[in-house]
């Protein structure tokens, strides 16, 4: 593949990454799949600066990010280490709440209306943000 040097149409460039902001809602797994089909991943927040950038673009709307604990440990979808990485949970979160009555706890993380993070039922249809790094090789074959 060739190295991506600029962001696709309708994606926003920031700090050598490209971001795409949905305007509809999907369950976390469907949002994750959507990003993967775009050769991207759900957004991985690695700094306060990136948090502010994403927050500015999504506004006060529940929005999925690429963080989940569906198999036990909290994991970022791109392999970024959760334990040593940036975190911005709301107070009292994550709480793996079982009181929603939908079965199971809360295994997927999203931005809340104030930008801080909450864990919620992965089936909820929230907006989402895809991210891809400009410096990574794209999956498209090189032009001959």
């Amino acid at each position: 593949g060739s190295e991506r040097t600029c962001c696709p149409v309708n994606w926003v460039e920031h700090e050598r990454s490209c971001y795409w902001f949905s305007r509809s809602g999907k369950a976390w797994a469907d949002a994750d799949n959507y990003c993967r089909l775009e050769d991207a991943h759900l957004v991985v927040v690695t700094s306060w600066e990136e948090q502010k950038f994403v927050q500015h673009h999504i506004g006060p709307v529940n929005t999925w990010m690429g963080l989940h604990d569906q198999n036990g440990p909290w994991k970022w979808v791109d392999g970024t280490d959760y334990e040593t990485g940036f975190k911005n949970w709301r107070p009292e979160q994550p709480d793996d709440w079982y009181g929603h009555g939908l079965g199971g706890g809360e295994d997927c993380a999203h931005f809340t209306d104030d930008g801080r993070w909450n864990d919620d039922v992965c089936q909820r249809p929230y907006r989402w943000v895809c991210e891809t790094e400009l410096d990574k090789a794209s999956q498209e074959p090189p032009l001959l």
């Epitope: 604990d69 569906q70 198999n71 036990g72 440990p73 909290w74 959760y82 334990e83 975190k87 949970w89 107070p91 009292e92 979160q93 994550p94 709480d95 793996d96 709440w97 079982y98 009181g99 079965g103 199971g104 706890g105």
Partner: antibody
Framework: EVHLVESGGGLVKPGGSLRLSCAAS????????MNWVRQAPGKGLEWVSS????????YYADSVKGRFTISRDNAKNSLYLQMNSLRAEDTAVYYC????????WGQGTLVTVSS | DIQMTQSPSSLSASVGDRVTITCRTS??????LVWFQQKPGKAPKRLIY???SLQSGVPSKFSGSGSGTDFTLTISSLQPEDFATYYC?????????FGPGTKMDFK
């Protein structure tokens, strides 16, 4: 690496009290719910209690409700189980385990209730 | 409370056998089920989570399937180290409940 170590077990008379501790390391303790599970000698596993990462939500098995209290100290990466009004049927190995799907367990601590 | 049943309660098998253990729940739990292996004097070890996902580090001879109320754990080719007791557990709702266990020993 995730590591859980229980302590505080021992021999206690019926009606007595005991406090178990679980020291956690290798992960961001406050991000995870924690559980106590017990196993009576020669018997199966029984879930005892759970506590959410910030202690907002606490759950107990009916068999221990009103007698046992689960708590945690996130600053110390520690989980506790205060056991009061102990009965012979509380005799078991007590394990602490992480998250609802119990992905990591400690080695257990034996509690014996006998006169 | 969700009741759990496991069958068989005990099983005699030989090295190389393909073995299947069944777990049934009294109500639907989607895929909120885990399987554990426990050896005498040791803590349980998680083999399968979310009914069919293999725990990291667990050999692929272990597999899980099912959803709703009926679940199975399969060991494709039994080895000496697999002789142990196996438990299922639901984490769909509190109180969490375990199956009574399946003890596997040598035929």
């Amino acid at each position: 690496e995730v590591h859980l170590v229980e302590s505080g077990g021992g021999l206690v008379k019926p009606g007595g009290s005991l406090r178990l501790s679980c020291a956690a390391s290798g992960f961001t303790f406050s991000s995870y719910s924690m559980n106590w599970v017990r196993q009576a000698p020669g018997k199966g596993l029984e879930w005892v209690s759970s506590i959410s990462g910030s202690s907002s939500f606490i759950y107990y098995a009916d068999s221990v409700k009103g007698r046992f209290t689960i708590s945690r100290d996130n600053a110390k990466n520690s989980l506790y189980l205060q056991m009061n009004s102990l009965r012979a049927e509380d005799t078991a190995v007590y394990y602490c385990a992480r998250v609802a799907a119990l992905d990591y367990w400690g080695q257990g601590t034996l509690v014996t209730v006998s006169s | 409370d969700i009741q759990m049943t496991q069958s068989p309660s005990s099983l005699s098998a030989s090295v190389g056998d393909r073995v299947t253990i069944t777990c049934r729940t009294s109500q639907g739990i989607n895929n909120y089920l885990v399987w554990f292996q426990q050896k005498p004097g040791k803590a349980p070890k998680r083999l399968i989570y979310a009914a069919s996902s293999l725990q990291s580090g667990v050999p692929s001879k272990f597999s899980g399937s099912g959803s709703g109320t009926d679940f199975t754990l399969t060991i494709s080719s039994l080895q000496p180290e697999d002789f142990a007791t196996y438990y299922c557990q639901q984490y769909y709702s509190y109180p969490f409940t375990f199956g009574p266990g399946t003890k596997m020993d040598f035929k």
